[in-house]
């Protein structure tokens, strides 16, 4: 079958999840599109001890992740609830900034410098960082 | 040994649709996104669509959007293109391809390419 | 859409000959180039990913150069079966778009 039982080569596996961590930048779209060839998605935090995880691996780099507000409201690329989940963003973030001249406002989330979020122009060529989940499936303990 | 084998190809009239197969063979098709381009007579290659290992995302070109469908069966290792509303300019070759990646970059490639089965529209 | 372009178009050389072939993306693909060989009815057959890096199998006459915009495909010493058509490809963004092609011929 096609169950994901264990990660590619070259992915890092973390509490039941792969990591995919680029080492050079794209537009956010890009990279959404890029995780989503692999069957991933743009990495998604659900938790101070995920935000760490993700800190540990990435740096002081500015890095996309997978929430935007593009199509009005924020949302996480997997559907995770933005209102009630976890967040992470510098003081006064996120601003949707027009000051940048680059036209529009600021429609992509990613980790600054510091590892807190930050909305930026989604066209800005960051790293990122891909995850997928290993099946449920191959969760379970094998029976005795 | 890798193999890839399309088939399906043929002469169809304008208007008309076509489903191209791409049979896979050693290696874990499920693992590898898979990719079509096309070859028109005499032309350059052009990438027409992409898809996920296991075949939830897809991806197309502006040119066959719309009209073409890329899928796959991991069961029967098989990649496939449903062509409808065929044009005269979709007169080619078509290739499927195995993508692989660079594990530093990350920078995908395609490392194994079918023989190709040629597609003519014409009235 | 990211624009190829690639020159020359056609190449006339001989047998032990150093060909060079450049491809231009539009925008900064960074490392994100593939080169492939072609030869008359049949397939593409890869020859560089990332640039640089030859693929398994694929004489070492074969190398490739060149980060953001511009690259370069070398065959240090041009043999018989290298007559053929090149085509650089960037993978980093949809759609994936080749060059037009080089045409390595007989001078």
């Known amino acids: 079958g096609s169950e994901r039982t264990c990660c590619p080569v070259n992915w890092v596996e973390h509490e039941r999840s792969c990591y995919w961590f680029s080492r050079s930048g794209k537009a956010w779209a890009d990279a959404d599109n890029y995780c989503r060839l692999e069957d991933a998605h743009l990495v998604v935090v659900t938790s101070w001890e995920e935000q760490k995880f993700v800190q540990r691996h990435i740096g002081p780099v500015n890095t996309w992740m997978g929430l935007h507000d593009q199509n009005g409201p924020w949302k996480w690329v997997d559907g995770t609830d933005y209102e009630t989940g976890f967040k992470n963003w510098r003081p006064e973030q996120p601003d949707d900034w027009y000051g940048h001249g680059l036209g529009g406002g600021e429609d992509c989330a990613h980790f600054t410098d510091d590892g807190r979020w930050n909305d930026d122009v989604c066209q800005r060529p960051y790293r990122w960082v891909c995850e997928t989940e290993l099946d449920k499936a191959s969760q379970e303990p094998p029976l005795l | 040994e890798v193999q890839l084998l399309e088939s399906g190809g043929g002469l169809v009239q304008p208007g008309g649709s076509l489903r191209l197969s791409c049979a896979a063979s050693?290696?874990?098709?499920?693992?590898?996104?898979m990719s079509w381009v096309r070859q028109a007579p005499g032309k350059g290659l052009e990438w027409v669509s992409a898809i996920s290992g296991r075949g939830g995302n897809t991806f197309y070109a502006d040119s066959v959007k719309g009209r073409f469908t890329i899928s796959r069966d991991n069961s029967k290792n098989t990649l496939y293109r449903q062509m409808n509303s065929l044009r005269a300019e979709d007169t080619a070759v078509y290739y499927c391809a195995k993508k692989d990646y660079d594990y530093v970059w990350g920078s995908p490639y395609f490392d194994y390419w079918g023989q190709g089965t040629l597609v003519t529209v014409s009235s | 859409d990211i624009q190829m372009t690639q020159s020359p178009a056609s190449v006339s050389a001989s047998v032990g000959d150093r060909v060079t072939i450049t491809c231009r993306a539009s925008q900064n693909i960074s490392n994100w180039l593939t080169w492939y060989q072609q030869k008359p009815g049949k397939a593409p057959k890869l020859l560089i990913y990332?640039?640089?890096s030859l693929q398994s199998g694929v004489p070492s006459r074969f190398s490739g150069s060149g980060s953001g915009t511009d690259f370069t495909l070398s065959i240090s010493s041009l043999q018989p079966e290298d007559f053929a058509t090149y085509y650089c490809q960037q993978t980093d963004s949809f759609p994936f778009t080749f060059g037009p092609g080089t045409k390595v011929d007989v001078k």
């Open positions: 990332a640039a640089s």
């Open positions: 050693g290696f874990t098709f499920s693992s590898y996104a």
